[in-house]
Every structure is written in structure tokens, then in C-alpha cells.
Interface confidence: medium
């Protein structure tokens, strides 16, 4: 892809319509509001030549310099251009695919979203108002020879003779001229060196560099070729009317013989290489939905076959201030929820035959990260989290809370800024993650804000699988399994032994393994085992057991 800042800014203030393209020599006026940057000179229209292999060196005739035309929304109109600035800044382009100047209204495209606008508006076709693409990546040629930029009342009269040939690799207007600069600053061009005899030129010479615009009729599916000349020319076999050749079939060559009373034989034989039908091309939005928040992809699709040589078809895009010379473009790193205007055109043998404009609004971007204000637990089974919402658009929140390897997620309303978590496990670390999301072309999740808390302690659950076994006449062995839920920071097992209602033993161990000795013989005992977590005791497990009558 070749994005190209436009070289010469052209104002549209005086022009009722905005043409989209220019054709080969002698070139078309590029009318458009200024875009950037190195090639642009403000307040001047500039013409450009096509960079085709057979146009490497061309003589510029005085007539051809007066005949710049522009493609129009309602047809073709002639656009008079102001004077050309002298290019004091050198431009030295080399042959390449970059389109040189492109002054575009898209440069003034809104960089902020427009409320109520459609995400995509498509202005297809053969006559839409769009931008101007000069076909030439090389030298600008003027339509009027004026040296006003050099004018100065303080300068003395000066006469200079210069003879230069116009070459598309040059950066300056080249013509054979004699220039007189008067003290008042006006430039007078004497034609003494341009035409040394009053004889008429041949029509072949006069119209050597005639340019053509093609207009398409969707109903008849035929083209009209508009000959870009000022005078009403005559065509052999009366094939043209008002400088227009009608009923041309796509992808067919037509030969037109051009003559006029201001020139002599031989006539100019113009071969019209008719482009493919406009409806065979469609500008398609090829943006991947996953990336539609920050990228735009546009692609010309051939939706029907045609016999024209596809090698002769070139595609141009202008998005904002940059130009691309591809059939497909992809703009990256764009702003979400912004409108971007792209103008495009298709040229056949450097003649524009269709164009389209798209205003694409990038999709909603991922929401920002919510800002957690606090997140804490003030009870054994509850926690609370509060937050500020993210700045960018979003639809809802997802709150996830993770304990060890378990994860639970909740969908929360976008208006919430606080959530109370219930039924939590006591004395457990919970990691919370909160993110906003938006359902756009796809769901886009914002970055998650994280926090954590540990719930308060609670009584542990009961020990289990408690056993009491006699190891001797007056000794017992008490064992139990740990509680399922400790619910606190510490681990201690307690055993209370009662005879009747009297507590006779009270022991505490790290493990639930007690050896109780020296009990009374033939006595009923109550054994109570429970777990203490440092904050709370658990419910005791109670077993009754009796010592036997002493065997001795």
C-alpha cells in the first residue's frame, strides 16, 4: 500500500462540483480542498501528467495548456485554474506507484463521531462527488502560464529567453517561452519563440494530447466519451456530438477522427479504449469484525466478468490525508467510535471511470478499566466491592470471584457501582476481577481491575469419624478426623472428658489423637472432641464409653 500525502492543495471555494480524477496529458485540474503536505501549495490548482511508459517526454502545446477539464457530479465541466506557483521546493520523484497529489476533502473529515450518523454510507458509482486523484506521481503542469509569484513592484523590467522541453521527470513547468516581467509585476508572455510562423498546426499535432472522460449510463450499460477540448471539434462519420462520442460498448476499442477549422490535415485519430462497466465493481467493507474498532479494510470487488485487460485497471484510495494505490486498503491503529472518510476511484488506462465514497465509523472499542475504590470483607460470609465505571462506552460489567481454584462470575448492570457478595466461605482469600464489556460487532471486554480480601473467621465445622477405644482397663484412645471447614487461622483439637456432670479431663493437641489414662474403673464417661481455629470453637463430637471392672 502506498499512502501519499497530497502535494498541491486546491481550493474548492470557487467550484460548484468536486472532480475525482485527472487523466493523461495534457492533464486535468485537480480540484479539492487542501490535504497534506510536501507537494501541496495553497490556493492553486495544479495539473499533472500521467506516468505511462509512452509519455516520458511530451511537447506541451499552447492549446493543450488551456484545456484542463474535470470530472463532475452532473457531467463534465471545464474548470479554469488559477496560476501555478513556482516550485521553489524541488520535488524529485522516481518512478513508482505513489500517486502524487491528492488534495482531499477527506482531510477535513470529522475526527470525532457524528451523532446519529450511519456507521457506513456508500456513495457508489460513476458520478459521485468525491476527491481528486491526479494520475501522475511526477511533475505538475500548469494550465495557465503566470509568473505572479515572481512579481514585485520593486523589480526592474527583465526579459529572459528560456527554451525547455516538458518531461514528466522534471519538477517544473517546461515550455518554450519568452517572458517579460514589467515593473508592475505583471508577466507578459510573448509567443515569438513558440510560433515563428502564422501557419495552422496539423490537427494531429493540435490534439496530440487530447484527454477523455468516460461517463456511464446504467440503463443502457453504454459509455459516453467526453473529449476535453474547448472548441467544438468535428469527428469523422459524424461520430461525435458536442464533443461527446456516444454509445460506446465496454471493453471495446473505438476509433475517432478529430478535425477542426483551426488546424489542417492530417486529422487526429483517437483510439478510445472503453473501460469495463461501472456496475461490475463494488466497493466492499472487508474489515474483520474482531478488529473493527481500530481498523478499516476496503476492497474493490469484481462482481461480474468483463473482457477488458485487468492489467490496465488501477485503483486509488484516499483516506484522510493519505493516498493508497491498491485494490484493497487496510488502515490500522485508528480511534474507536470515530468516523473516517475514504474516497476511491478506479481508472482504466489512466482514465477514471468510476468512484465511490465511504464514511466508516469504527466500532466501539474495548471499554477502559473500572477503578476499584475498595474491596473488603466485614463478615465471615460476605464481602463488598465498590468502583467507578470506565470512561468509554460499555454495556455491562462482569464480576468474577475466585477462591483457590473455583471461579464464579456474575453479570452486573452497567449502572451499578457497588456489589455485595453473599454466601462466601469464612476465612478464605477471594480474588475479585471486574471488567466492563460492550456488545458491538463482537463482544469486547475491557481490562479487568483486580482486588482481593479474606473473609472473617467463623466457627469451624464438627470433627468427624471420632472413635473411642479401650487400651487397658483404665485407659482410652480417642481419635477423630479434622473438620471439613476450619474457618479460621489456627488448628487445635480439644478433648473434654466428663464423668456425670463433672469435667475430669481437658486436653488440647495439635492432632486429634488423645490417650486418656488413669480413669476410674467401671465408670461411664462422656468424651467431647472439638476443633478450635484460634477464633472460634467448633461443635463437639460426643461419644459415651465406660471403663470395665478391673480385671486384677
Amino acid at each position: 500500500q502506498s499512502p501519499t500525502p497530497s502535494p498541491t492543495g486546491l481550493t474548492t471555494a470557487k467550484m460548484p462540483s468536486v472532480p475525482l480524477s485527472s487523466d493523461p496529458l495534457p492533464t486535468h485540474t485537480t480540484a479539492f480542498s487542501p490535504a497534506s503536505t510536501f507537494e501541496r501549495e495553497n490556493d492553486f490548482s495544479e495539473t499533472t501528467t500521467s506516468l505511462s511508459p509512452d509519455n516520458t517526454s511530451t511537447q506541451v502545446s499552447p492549446d493543450s495548456l488551456d484545456n484542463a477539464s474535470a470530472f463532475n457530479t452532473t457531467g463534465v465541466s471545464s474548470v479554469q485554474t488559477p496560476h501555478l506557483p513556482t516550485h521553489a521546493d524541488s520535488q524529485t520523484p522516481s518512478a513508482g506507484t505513489d500517486t502524487q497529489t491528492f488534495s482531499g476533502s477527506a482531510a477535513n473529515a470529522k475526527l470525532n463521531p457524528t451523532p446519529g450518523s450511519n456507521a457506513i454510507s456508500d456513495v457508489p458509482g460513476e458520478r459521485s462527488t468525491a476527491s481528486t486523484f491526479p494520475t501522475d506521481p511526477v511533475s505538475p503542469l500548469t494550465t495557465t502560464l503566470s509568473l505572479a509569484h515572481h512579481s514585485s513592484a520593486a523589480l526592474p523590467a527583465r526579459t529572459s529567453n528560456t527554451t525547455i522541453t516538458a518531461n514528466t521527470s522534471d519538477a517544473y513547468l517546461n515550455a518554450s517561452e519568452t517572458t517579460t516581467l514589467s515593473p508592475s509585476g505583471s508577466a507578459v508572455i510573448s509567443t515569438t519563440t513558440i510560433a515563428t510562423t502564422p501557419s495552422k498546426p496539423t490537427c494531429d499535432e493540435k490534439y496530440a494530447n487530447i484527454t477523455v472522460d468516460y461517463l456511464y449510463n446504467k440503463e443502457t450499460k453504454l459509455f459516453t466519451a467526453k473529449l476535453n477540448v474547448n472548441e467544438n471539434v468535428e469527428c469523422g462519420n459524424n461520430t461525435c456530438t458536442n464533443n461527446e462520442v456516444h454509445n460506446l460498448t465496454e471493453c471495446k476499442n473505438a476509433s475517432v477522427s478529430i478535425s477542426h477549422n483551426s488546424c489542417t490535415a492530417p486529422d487526429k485519430t483517437l483510439i478510445l479504449d472503453v473501460p469495463p462497466g461501472v456496475e461490475k465493481f463494488q466497493l466492499h467493507d472487508c474489515t474483520q469484525v474482531e478488529k473493527a474498532d481500530t481498523t478499516i479494510c476496503l476492497k474493490w470487488k469484481n462482481i461480474e466478468t468483463f473482457t477488458c485487460d485487468t492489467q490496465n485497471i488501477t485503483y486509488r484510495f484516499q483516506c484522510g490525508n493519505m493516498i493508497f494505490d491498491n485494490k484493497e486498503i487496510k488502515l490500522e491503529n485508528l480511534e474507536p467510535e470515530h468516523e473516517y472518510k475514504c474516497d476511491s476511484e478506479i481508472l482504466y488506462n489512466n482514465h477514471k471511470f468510476t468512484n465511490a465514497s465511504k464514511i466508516i465509523k469504527t466500532d466501539f472499542g474495548s471499554p477502559g478499566e473500572p477503578q476499584i475504590i475498595f474491596c473488603r470483607s466485614e463478615a465471615a460470609h460476605q464481602g463488598v466491592i465498590t468502583w467507578n465505571p470506565p470512561q468509554r462506552s460499555f454495556h455491562n460489567f462482569t464480576l468474577c470471584y475466585i477462591k483457590e481454584t473455583e471461579k464464579d462470575c456474575l453479570n452486573l448492570d452497567k449502572n451499578l457501582i457497588k456489589y455485595d457478595l453473599q454466601n462466601l466461605k469464612p476465612y478464605t482469600k477471594y480474588v475479585l476481577s471486574l471488567h466492563a464489556y460492550i456488545i458491538a460487532k463482537v463482544q469486547r471486554n475491557g481490562s479487568a481491575a483486580m482486588c482481593h480480601f479474606t473473609t472473617k473467621s467463623a466457627p469451624p465445622s464438627q470433627v468427624w469419624n471420632m472413635t473411642v477405644s479401650m487400651t487397658s482397663d483404665n485407659s482410652m484412645h480417642v481419635k477423630c478426623r479434622p473438620p471439613r471447614d476450619r474457618n479460621g487461622p489456627h488448628e487445635r483439637y480439644h478433648l473434654e472428658v466428663e464423668a456425670g456432670n463433672t469435667l475430669v479431663r481437658n486436653e488440647s493437641h495439635k492432632n486429634c489423637d488423645f490417650r486418656v489414662k488413669d480413669l476410674q474403673y467401671s465408670t461411664d464417661y462422656t468424651f467431647k472432641a472439638y476443633f478450635h481455629n484460634g477464633d472460634y470453637p467448633g461443635e463437639p463430637f460426643i461419644l459415651h464409653h465406660s471403663t470395665s471392672y478391673n480385671s486384677k
Epitope: 495553497n42 522516481s94 482531510a107 484522510g320
Partner: antibody, heavy 119, light 106 residues
């Protein structure tokens, strides 16, 4: 993250040549116009040269025209500035700059490389 | 060539102050104006592009305005880290920079 790293700056005698390089990363180099800007120590900024994404269009101001050549190698993501017939007034820090995709201004700059022309 | 006249060339302000820097073009530049911040020993950094569009990652206290030939950079509430030299750049026709405004804290 967009990164532009210039190199090749040196102390040279007037009339000699020097070639600056700028390696780009973090963006699709082939999609963007590039520019060289220079700054005389403690002074203002001056545009030096610009090149289109494919290298097909090149622009210079009068001050360096016919002496400096900007070029790029898209396969290597590298921008070059060949400086010939150097003069003392070319002494400056030279910055490699990426043009904004939409408006055409300079949206990312390298840290610069210092060129001193002195006998 | 389009000339850019930037004023003032030197500015001293206090933290929290509203600061404005102006650039005047010798002819209409159709909003093709960017503002850059350059801190000592560093490369310039884009703040505002195309007159009033805040570049990614730049604090919202920076704003730009203007049209035709007159353009303004505004810092709504000056912060210590804003001490730098500020340049305007027109890229309507080739590139020309303003002379710079050195901003210091009082």
C-alpha cells in the same frame, strides 16, 4: 510500540559524505511516508527530506537539494539519508520521523543522531 | 515558503496556570498545524495534530484551536512536567516550524 532508531551520525570534514540510517519497528513501515528533520543545537527545527511509502515520490527543500538523497528499504524497515558535499551549516541532530496516517504530520520521532561538519 | 511566527518565545508560568501559545502563518494553512513538545535532550513529541486533535496518550489539559492563519495551543492547568519547549508545525505546504516557545515555571 512505535520505535525509530537513527544511526550513522559522525564528525566529518566539509565536502565529505555521510549516510544516516533509521530502523523502524512497531508499525507497518511500508504503509507510511517518512521524513528527516534536523535541529541545530538549542535552535529550531528544519525539514530535510520526505519519501512516500513506496519510495516513488521524494521531496527536498532548496537547502539540501542536489546534495542529500532520501531512500528507503521496505524489506529491511529502514530509512536512509545520504548526505554529500556536507557544509558546516548541516551540523545538527537529525531525526527520523513517521508521518501520521491520516493528517500527514509527524506522529513519531526517533531520538536523533548527531552530525558535526567541521574541519 | 509559508512562514510560521510563534509567540511568545519565552514564557514563565506557575503550576495550575492556564497557558496559551500562538502560531501565525504567513498564509492560510487550512488547519494543517501540529503542536510538539520537546524536553531538554529529548526528541519532539506530538501533542496535537490537525489543529485540535489530541494525540494518543496526551493528557486532556492540552488543547488546540484555530483556523486560517491563526492557531493556539492551550494548557488548561500547567503541571511541573509541562516544562519544555513547544513548537508548531505547518504541513499545508511542505513543512515549516515555528521558532519555539520555551516554557518555564515561575
Amino acid at each position: 510500540e512505535v520505535q525509530l532508531v537513527e544511526s550513522g551520525g559522525d564528525l566529518v570534514q566539509p565536502g565529505r559524505s555521510l549516510k544516516l540510517s533509521c530502523i523502524a519497528s512497531g508499525f507497518t513501515f511500508t504503509n507510511f511516508w517518512m521524513t528527516w528533520i534536523r535541529q541545530v543545537s538549542g535552535k529550531g527545527l528544519e525539514w530535510v527530506a520526505s519519501i512516500s511509502s513506496s519510495g516513488g515520490s521524494i521531496y527536498y527543500p532548496d537547502s539540501v537539494k542536489d546534495r542529500f538523497t532520501i531512500s528507503r528499504d521496505n524489506a529491511k524497515n529502514t530509512l536512509y539519508l545520504q548526505m554529500n558535499s556536507l557544509r558546516s551549516e548541516d551540523t545538527a541532530t537529525y531525526y527520523c520521523v513517521k508521518l501520521h496516517y491520516y493528517s500527514g504530520g509527524g506522529d513519531a520521532w526517533g531520538q536523533g543522531t548527531s552530525v558535526t561538519v567541521s574541519s | 515558503d509559508i512562514q510560521m511566527t510563534q509567540s511568545p518565545s519565552f514564557l514563565s508560568a506557575s503550576v495550575g496556570d492556564r497557558v496559551t501559545i500562538n502560531c501565525k502563518a504567513s498564509q492560510n494553512i487550512n488547519k494543517y498545524l501540529d503542536w510538539y513538545q520537546q524536553k531538554h535532550g529529548e526528541a519532539p513529541k506530538l501533542l496535537i495534530h490537525y489543529t485540535n486533535n489530541l494525540h494518543t496518550g496526551i493528557p486532556s489539559r492540552f488543547s488546540g484551536s484555530g483556523s486560517g492563519t491563526d492557531y493556539t495551543l492551550t494548557i488548561s492547568s500547567l503541571q511541573p512536567e509541562d516544562v519544555a519547549t513547544y513548537f508548531c508545525l505547518q504541513h499545508s505546504s511542505r513543512w515549516t516550524f515555528g521558532g519555539g516557545t520555551k516554557l518555564e515555571l515561575k
